[in-house]
Every structure is written in C-alpha cells, then in structure tokens.
Amino acid sequence: RAPRCRELPAQKWWHTGALYRIGDLQAFQGHGSGNLAGLKGRLDYLSSLKVKGLVLGPLHKNQKDDVAQTDLLQIDPNFGSKEDFDNLLQSAKKKSIRVILDLTPNYRGENLWFSTQVDSVATKVKDALEFWLQAGVDGFQVRDIENLKDASSFLAEWENITKGFSEDRLLIAGTNSSDLQQIVSLLESNKDLLLTSSYLSDSSFTGEHTKSLVTQYLNATGNRWCSWSLSQAGLLTSFLPAQLLRLYQLMLFTLPGTPVFSYGDEIGLKAAALPGQPVEAPVMLWDESSFPDIPGAVSANMTVKGQSEDPGSLLSLFRQLSDQRSKERSLLHGDFHTFSSGPGLFSYIRHWDQNERFLVVLNFGDVGLSAGLQASDLPASASLPTKADLVLSTQPGREEGSPLELERLKLEPHEGLLLRFPYVA
C-alpha cells in the first residue's frame, strides 16, 4: 500500500512567495513623476516577478518632525488621492498581488517615531490600522521599531487589531538591529509578526558563517515562520559584495520563510551609483532613458529592459527562482536540513513528504571547490541520492536539467546550485 500523504500545513498568502518593497514611489517609477496611478501601470511587471505582496510607502502626509502635521489617514497629494489608492488595490487584487502599507509615521523626519510623543503617535497608528484595513489593504509595515519605546506591547496591540480584522492580514516590523537576542524578544510577544532586520548583513560572508547565522536564527525562533532579507529597507547591493548577489538571491528564495526584496534587487540596482541620486532611493532603471541627466551613464545590461532580453541576467535568475519558490511544495513549506560540505560552502536540503526534493549548494569562496557533500548528518527522511538534476546555476555554462553526480560535484567561485531529485520510498 502507498504511504499516507503528510497533511499540508495551513498556508497564508505571504508563505507562498516573495514580498517586494517600494519605499519610494517616485524613485521606483523614474524621475520625479511617480504616483499611485503610474504604479498601476507597473503591476504587470510585478506579476512577471511572481511576487506575492507589494510593501508600499509610506504614502501618508508627513511634515518633517511635526506630529500635528502628520496624518496617517491622508495620502500625500504628491502621490495621488485616496481614489487612486483604491483603484490600485482593485487592480492589484485582480493580479493576485497583495498590498501592504507602510505606516512608519515620521518617514520624512529625524526620528521615525517622534521620540517625545510616542503615546499619541501610537494612538494615531491604531486608528490608521483600522481605517486602512477597512479600505482593503492586506497588511502593514512599521520600521525602525528599535526607536519605539515599549515596542513589544505596541506591536502586540497592533497585531491584535490586524489579526482581529482577519487572520489573512499581515503585520511586518522592521528593525536596524542585527542582535539575535533583541530580535527574539521582539518576536516572542507576537505570534504572527514578520520581522525584517539587519541580522544576515552582520556577516563575514563566508559559507561557514552564513550557515551558522541561518541555523542559529532558525533554532532561536523555533517553528515560527521567518522572513529573510539583509535589512529592513535597503538594497542588497548596499550590503553585499557584488559577486555574491546571485548566490544570495538563490539562498533567500530557498530558505524556509518569506524572502523580502526591495525594488531594484532583481536587477542589482546600486544605491547612489549614478551621480546626484539619493543614497537610499536610487531611480529604478527601466531602460537606458531612465537616467537622462548624464547620457550614456546607463548601459542596457543595467536595466529591466536589457536584462529581460538576456536569459543569463540577474533578473532572469530572479524570475526563475521566484517561479520555483511559488510552485514547489518542498520550497513552499518543506523541512530544512543543513549538512556538512567542503570549507567555504553552505549546503542544505528542502523536502516535503513524497514531493520532489531540492538540494542547494552555495560556494561563498573566491576559488572553485569540490562540494564534498557528507550526508551522514542528515536524517533518514532526507537522504541524498547519487545523482540530482540541475534546476539552475547562478553562473553561466551549465546545462539546465542535466544530471550531476553528487560525489564528484565541483563548484565555480561564488557559484550556487539548485538541484532536484525525486522522493524514493
């Protein structure tokens, strides 16, 4: 008789794929012209990335450091009207993209939480949560919570409002902290909170260190759902050496949890790489005309248009990974096991019941290495086969779909491999 299938876990929409942050509407759409109506026209692009949620804003009225002139219920007219926002929500819903609204109050100011008036700001946030939930948003983000006095209790209250409205709504909190103790204490009082932090960016970017960071995090947070990013708001290029960008995309998409990206991560957009741009919000490079100030500053391979036409580009890799992440059971909610491999490598398996299994091997080193996979520390339920099929490599030159002998597996410098193999009873 065939073995019984394992019962599927309850899956919320944010478990099914990546979140995409657009913190600056104008920079995302190009020079100074960005508004909600224009963003509607970019939803097809977001669909092509197969992201599940859009983390948007802040969009509310905020006069720098002035509580009285900060209104979390009013959209800043520079971004459009409430009607434009409603239209965006409707259009996003039709494309199965959820919209999460950033309500960080003093986003134009010095202290994002108006340090002296925390209580009155917290009440405003409470009111805003209810208002925007009724307007149809799918969740909220608040950032810099390390600067919010008594953050845990406020977050618990806000999560109650959010989940009280519907279990299908999400609260994301962001912190600049990379301290695991601090992160765990924030998570403890909120069962369903998604927390973005700088935890992974406090790294020596070696295979061993990354492995220990990931396993420590997963052990400390128990069986709760995680999110993976390198910061609460910034671009990957601001934290990573360029040669590790592809490797990290592969890792973020295949770790157990929700990957969270910022606009531009999919093309390797760099903060302040072009003259005169704001550091934190570089202009999105849609095509070569996106940066008209200096002719020739943008080459095709830096842009969405150029990379869309190149199957070997970072954008193509992102799309492939996002596609796999959103449809494969083992990547959606599979168990996770790391195992020993050569120095400089980080290797792990994702598996779910009798579904196809995935092996990830990441070479963080500057030299080519033998994988040296040692499956002895894997549980019997996750044993390795002798061969696995290549789903993708982060480097060009390997033939997708080809079977690779695991015992003789070698990786190029900074190469990551995603391999698949079937369940065998």
Partner: nanobody, 125 residues
Framework: QVHLVESGGGLVQAGGSLRLSCAAS????????MGWFRQAPGKEREFVGT????????YYTDSVKGRFTISRDNAKNTVYLEMNSLKPEDTAVYFC??????????????????WGQGTQVTVSS
C-alpha cells in the same frame, strides 16, 4: 442599543457657518468610531467625515476638507460637525452614525450599526 439624535441644522446663507451636534444615549460611545453622512434630495447617502474613538484621528471627504471639522466630547457622549464657508451644494439632510466594531469609522455607510434620524441643512445663495 444606542440612540443617536442630531440637532443644529437650519437655513443659512452661502459662506455662513453651522454647528451640528449628535447626542448619544443608551450606551457610552467612547469605544465607537463615529461618522457623519449626508443625503441631498434624489441622491445617494454620501460620506462626509469620521472621527476615531479618542478623537485623535479624523478623515474627511475631499469636498469638505478644510471647511468642516469633526470633534467629540466623550464625557458628554456627543459628536460635533462644525461647518464653515458653506456652499449651496452642501444642502442635504445630515446624519451621524456609530461603528461599534471599529475605533475608526470608515467611509462606507455599510460599516455603521446605528444611525440618527438626520437634521436638515439648507444653504441659500
């Protein structure tokens, strides 16, 4: 059961002001979001504005922004609508409403559980 009674309506010239009150009885309204709506003859009921439980937050429809102000006195169980620079197109029956489930009443009238009977406001040119 919450009973809402509006008052303060009347006839006023364009450019003039009125202050409407909405007195609640039966239950304290300090944990309810409160909203004001209006209905002109032959038209749909239209959202005017809303105020949160504590009075910290207010939200208005674009056509009244900067002219109308909603406030509340929870000790008196009363909500107010201050209307300045009135225009003939503000002519309508004005209703107050209570949302018992949310601290922040919303812009759709379906979200409100209790309604007053309304007070007529007529603005002549």
């Amino acid at each position: 059961q919450v009973h809402l009674v509006e008052s303060g309506g009347g006839l006023v010239q364009a450019g003039g002001s009125l202050r409407l009150s909405c007195a609640a009885s039966g239950r304290t309204i300090s944990t309810y979001g409160m909203g004001w709506f209006r209905q002109a003859p032959g038209k749909e009921r239209e959202f005017v504005g809303t105020i949160s439980c504590s009075g910290t937050s207010t939200y208005y429809t674009d056509s009244v922004k900067g002219r109308f102000t909603i406030s509340r006195d929870n000790a008196k169980n009363t909500v107010y609508l201050e209307m300045n620079s009135l225009k003939p197109e503000d002519t309508a029956v004005y209703f107050c409403a209570a949302d018992t489930r949310h601290c922040m009443g919303y812009t759709k009238h379906g979200g409100y559980d209790y309604w007053g009977q309304g007070t007529q406001v007529t603005v002549s040119s």
